[in-house]
């Protein structure tokens, strides 16, 4: 039975040209995390694998930094980055947990952050 839950940074907004940290946290399970995937809609952004470390997809290499923690930092944001992002935790023996974050990239300088982790 899957007992875990994923907390995410929820709906967040950021300014065009700026950067944002996407964070998820898996809690309430003793399952071992073997890999965390970060995806944007159907595109793979990055993987953090227990044995192999971080892999950033070539098309995002210049704009995506691994971390902090199991999170992901998106840099040089464009309006096209607006959309859904998913953290997918692969665990043993539970299976897969998925968290969703919606990012809105704003043109103006009045972007305000929604609910966020205190860990940036």
């Amino acid at each position: 039975m899957m007992t875990g839950t994923i907390e995410t940074t929820g709906n967040i907004s950021a300014e065009k040209g700026g950067s944002i940290i996407l964070q998820c946290h898996l809690s309430s399970t003793t399952a071992q995390v073997t890999q965390v995937n970060w995806e944007q809609q159907d595109q793979l952004l990055a993987i953090c694998n227990a044995d192999l470390g971080w892999h950033i997809s070539p098309s995002f290499k210049d704009r995506v930094a691994p971390g902090p923690g199991l999170g992901l930092t998106l840099q040089s944001l464009t309006v096209n980055d607006t959309g859904e992002y998913f953290c997918i935790y692969h665990t043993y023996p539970d299976g897969t947990y998925t968290g969703r974050i919606f990012l809105e990239v704003l043109e103006s300088s009045v972007a305000e952050h929604g609910a966020r982790f205190q860990i940036p």
Epitope: C48, A50, G53, W54, A65, P66, G69, L70, Q118, I119
Partner: antibody
């Protein structure tokens, strides 16, 4: 298996600089953050900063900005830490370490830096 | 910066005794906490990562618990080889910070 081999002890003069190294083997160097930790005799552990060789990203403890510079040479799988304007306060053992949230941390054997006139 | 308050700073315990060391973060760090053992003139050794996960090769008498702000390292039955200094480390955001250490000695 993962190994981090650090350079040997250094005896350096106050006001000068020193560059110590950490050669990684047994894993893909560009895929993991590599950090540096300071330990003065009789003191605890202090995090200096870390570097992600795959993109050159760095994080520094504010206290060590301007003191430590972290670099990495991916061709030789070696990370470096340069310490500048050395004083007696910089005399310490410096450890390199490799970690992820998913596997824990591997440590180098430490490099003793002694600053003395 | 997040401050890690570790206690006790030193302690004596008897062989076979259950020993608990605690670390308190100044704010929520989720599960981004590791525990290390260090012996004199040696590199630290990872015991626990991600708050509760036992590192490879570490005896099962060591365990970690907690999340958020309060964490603990427990040795279920103390052995002579456990004489060392123990440190916690939070690694969820830069700068990472260590606890002050706990020096554990045998009575």
């Amino acid at each position: 298996q993962v190994q981090l081999q650090q350079s040997g002890a250094e005896l350096v003069r106050p006001g000068t600089s020193v560059k110590i190294s950490c050669k990684a083997s047994g894993y893909t160097f560009t895929n993991f953050w590599l950090g540096w930790v300071k330990q003065r005799p009789g003191h605890g552990l202090e995090w200096v900063g870390d570097i992600f060789p795959g993109g050159g990203y760095t994080n520094y403890n504010e206290k060590f900005k301007g003191k430590a510079t972290l670099t990495a040479d991916t061709s030789s799988s070696t990370a470096y830490m340069q310490l500048s304007s050395l004083t007696s306060e910089d005399s310490a053992v410096y450890f390199c370490s490799r970690s992820t949230m998913l596997t824990g941390t591997y440590w180098g054997q430490g490099t003793l830096v002694t600053v003395s006139a | 910066d997040i401050k890690m308050t570790q206690s006790p700073s030193s302690m004596y315990a008897s062989l076979g005794e259950r020993v608990t060391i605690t670390c308190k973060a100044s704010r929520d760090i989720k599960s981004y906490l590791s525990w290390y053992q260090q012996k004199p003139w040696k590199s630290p050794k990872t015991l626990i990562f991600y708050a509760t996960r036992l590192a490879d090769g570490v005896p099962s008498r060591f365990s970690g618990s907690g999340s958020g702000q309060d964490f603990s390292l427990t040795i279920s039955s103390l052995e002579s080889d456990d004489t060392a200094t123990y440190y916690c480390l939070h690694h969820g955001e830069s700068p990472y910070t260590f606890g002050g250490g706990t020096k554990l000695e045998i009575k």
